[in-house]
């Protein structure tokens, strides 16, 4: 297990922002809706790298698009409430990376749905806290 | 130190709903993610689905979507897990458990005519 | 939805015996396994996390293997109070799912 509480606290604040991911893409999974279809059609841009906290930069610039999308999804059997999840993915984040970061995102050629845009992300997660495990 | 206590064993009738209460103690209420976990008499383990309790959103096992309704009081640091349309097979033990190392002891609920 | 298939479903065993028990995930989940031990009337307790990381207190005789599909309990030695059932878990896509459960008796 981690050892020092600065690793403790990234490694928490990742679980959490990879539960918020998983969360949603459970949500886009469950969605048996017209919308869905709608939702498959929106682009988001995927990070050329992510292989460290200050590629979560990318994920950041995403977060709006991110919202608007699943701002299409609200209905009784759509249990994500969008700005707050958001807003809590968007805190988690900037602790993560580091509100000073001047770091540059560089982006893919390829754009992706929001299922691969998800998928990107929840395996970047999963990757950096099994490294520090 | 920490810990989650359910409230007690519940008998309701079929297409009756139950809400199970798990109020958390010992730790930051909001710091950590809640899953419910289901258990029929003699059989496995049924993740139902989980919710993050600062802001209240929730995301459900597909099974269970649109009967459950999970819900959170930051005021008394607890969380509620509410199944509608109950029937017979819904008759089993649930749980809550917080980062997965720490669980309440279980309510039964029994679904009966 | 990732299953997960435990194995055997039952095993006899006595106190100091050498127990295995296998988890096969039906898709590739990394490390991301736990190994629970349940008794009768209680709720669930967590073992092992991250496919070998040994939760706090639990004894050293318990350990975890594997990654991607495969994985493995064993308990070196096994004492009176680990007659039980063991669950595995996979906790890298939701929904979360368990293995069906591993009673270990006493022969």
């Known amino acids: 297990a981690p050892t020092s509480s600065s690793t403790k606290k990234t490694q928490l604040q990742l679980e959490h922002l990879l539960l918020d991911l998983q969360m949603i893409l459970n949500g886009i999974n469950n969605y048996k809706n017209p919308k869905l279809t709608r939702m498959l059609t929106f682009k988001f841009y995927m990070p050329k790298k992510a292989t460290e906290l200050k590629h979560l930069q990318c994920l950041e610039e995403e977060l709006k698009p991110l919202e608007e999308v699943l701002n299409l999804a609200q209905s009784k059997n759509f249990h994500l409430r969008p700005r707050d999840l958001i807003s809590n993915i968007n805190v988690i984040v900037l602790e993560l990376k580091g509100s000073e970061t001047t770091f540059m995102c560089e982006y893919a050629d390829e754009t992706a749905t929001i299922v691969e845009f998800l998928n990107r992300w929840i395996t970047f997660c999963q990757s950096i806290i099994s490294t520090l495990t | 130190q920490v810990q989650l206590v359910q409230s007690g064993a519940e008998v309701k009738k079929p297409g009756a709903s139950v809400k199970v209460s798990c109020k958390a103690s010992g730790y930051t209420f909001t710091r950590y993610y809640m899953h419910w976990v289901r258990q029929a008499p003699g059989q496995g383990l049924e993740w139902m689905g989980i919710?993050?309790?600062?802001?209240?959103?929730?995301s459900y096992a597909l099974k269970f979507q649109g009967r459950v309704t999970m819900t959170r009081d930051t005021s008394t640091s607890t969380v509620y897990m509410e199944l509608s349309s109950l029937r017979s097979e819904d008759t089993a033990v649930y749980y809550c458990?917080?980062?997965?190392?720490?669980w309440g002891q279980g309510t039964l609920v029994t679904v009966s005519s | 939805d990732i299953q997960m298939t435990q194995s055997p479903s039952s095993l006899s065993a006595s106190v100091g015996d050498r127990v295995t028990i296998t988890c096969r995930a039906s898709q590739s989940i990394s490390t991301w396994l736990a190994w629970y031990q349940q008794k009768p009337g209680k709720a669930p307790k967590l073992l092992i996390y991250?496919?070998?990381s040994l939760d706090e207190g639990v004894p050293s005789r318990f350990s975890g293997s594997g990654s991607g599909t495969d994985f493995t309990l064993t308990i070196s030695s096994l004492q009176p109070e680990d007659f039980a059932t063991y669950y595995c878990q996979q906790s890298y896509s939701f929904p979360v799912t368990f293995g069906q459960g591993t009673k270990v008796e006493i022969k």
């Open positions: 991250a496919a070998s």
């Open positions: 919710i993050q309790p600062r802001a209240g959103y929730t």
């Open positions: 458990t917080s980062g997965w190392d720490v």
